[in-house]
Interface confidence: medium
């Protein structure tokens, strides 16, 4: 069953290569367990960036080596992706699944275009 997922169209990563955006879903049911997956689409290839399953009202728990962190509040998930470089520029798609209880719902956002600009190296300063 389909579910609407909204996310911003464009986000610019900061100078430290960190980008944050909100993924909001219109929950048709009373989910207790939600799974959020971030997908990256570039050159028609889609790869999974990170995923987390969380209980409503609890924190998102990504794997220890994940580049993602996040918090949840109601039907909103605040996602942060770290360690981005210019080559990671692309469309980042938020996929939300209401895992439990039935019925299962799944929704995919239109994607957030994340632009990453590598910082210019600091020139050596002479004293």
């Amino acid at each position: 069953k389909a579910m609407h997922v909204a996310q911003p169209a464009v986000v610019l990563a900061n100078s430290r290569g960190t980008a944050s955006f909100v993924c909001e879903y219109a929950s048709p049911g009373k989910a207790t367990e939600v799974r959020v997956t971030v997908l990256r689409q570039a050159d028609s290839q889609v790869t999974e960036v990170c995923a987390a399953t969380y209980m409503m009202g609890n924190e998102l728990t990504f794997l220890d080596d994940s580049i993602c962190t996040g918090t949840s509040s109601g039907n909103q998930v605040n996602l942060t992706i770290q360690g981005l470089r210019a080559m990671d520029t692309g469309l980042y798609i938020c996929k939300v699944e209401l895992m439990y209880p039935p019925p299962y719902y799944m929704g995919i956002g239109n994607g957030t275009q994340i632009y990453v600009i590598d910082p210019e190296p600091c020139p050596d300063s002479d004293f």
Epitope: G29, K30, T32, E33, T53, M55, E97, M99, Y100, P101, P102, P103, Y104
Partner: antibody, heavy 120, light 112 residues
Framework: EVQLLESGGGLVQPGGSLRLSCAAS????????MNWVRQAPGKGLEWVSA????????YYADSVKGRFTISRDNSKNTLYLQMNSLRAEDTAVYYC?????????????WGQGTLVTVSS | QSVLTQPPSASGTPGQRVTISCTGS?????????VHWYQQLPGTAPKLLIY???QRPSGVPDRFSGSKSGTSASLAISGLRSEDEADYYC???????????FGGGTKLTVLG
């Protein structure tokens, strides 16, 4: 091929305890929510309990709430049902059943069941 | 007392068409939850027969069909055969009970 094999059934006295196991194979166990369904002799099917794939969500029928505990060990691909304070009316064949890949849409695969008899 | 209501028995002769009804309420079938049907042959575990109201798993003959309307659903078996003699159960999720609910089962007898 999906296989579900229940064990742990037997004869137990009223007020006693029993732990049922369901060994799963042929699929990625942690991706599926699992259920226990029972059938008393000559009677219909009764859903007992369910647990989500992560183990984070559990649900129970009112008839067993507070007495039965469902759990899972995803590293061992095994589902459990701890049954305490057993009553004569708990006598039944207990089936474990797997939800579909869409997670919670229907009970698609069933084990062959294990018989629990509560009698003095 | 089952949450979903089915007739306790049904019968027909080989080649006939029989229908088994399943009536629920606003917290299960009427809430939009799908209805699923199971066949239980004597001495065996239940087997999925129809899922999501009208879908057949692979291997289930097209003689079996399902439908749903409002708070009710039905299972139809056409071209009845002796091997169809079994117990049939409907099931749906119930959001007030937070669990699966079943019908009481219908024992189908193939006469003659």
């Amino acid at each position: 091929e999906v296989q579900l094999l229940e064990s742990g059934g037997g004869l137990v006295q009223p007020g006693g305890s029993l732990r049922l196991s369901c060994a799963a194979s042929g699929f990625t166990f942690s991706s599926y929510s699992m259920n226990w369904v029972r059938q008393a002799p000559g009677k219909g099917l009764e859903w007992v309990s369910a647990i989500s794939g992560s183990g984070g969500s559990t649900y129970y029928a009112d008839s067993v709430k507070g007495r039965f505990t469902i759990s899972r060990d995803n590293s061992k691909n095994t589902l459990y049902l701890q049954m305490n304070s057993l009553r004569a009316e708990d006598t039944a064949v207990y089936y474990c059943a797997r939800d579909r890949v869409e997670m919670n849409q229907w009970l698609a695969d069933w084990g062959q069941g294990t018989l629990v008899t509560v009698s003095s | 007392q089952s949450v979903l209501t089915q007739p306790p028995s049904a019968s027909g002769t080989p080649g006939q068409r029989v229908t088994i009804s399943c009536t629920g309420s606003s917290s299960n079938i009427g809430a939009g939850y799908d209805v699923h049907w199971y066949q239980q042959l004597p001495g065996t575990a239940p087997k999925l027969l129809i899922y999501r109201n009208n879908q057949r798993p692979s291997g289930v003959p097209d003689r079996f069909s399902g439908s749903k309307s409002g708070t009710s659903a039905s299972l139809a078996i056409s071209g009845l055969r002796s091997e169809d003699e079994a117990d049939y159960y409907c099931a749906a999720w119930d959001d007030s009970l937070n669990g699966w609910v079943f019908g009481g089962g219908t024992k189908l007898t193939v006469l003659g």
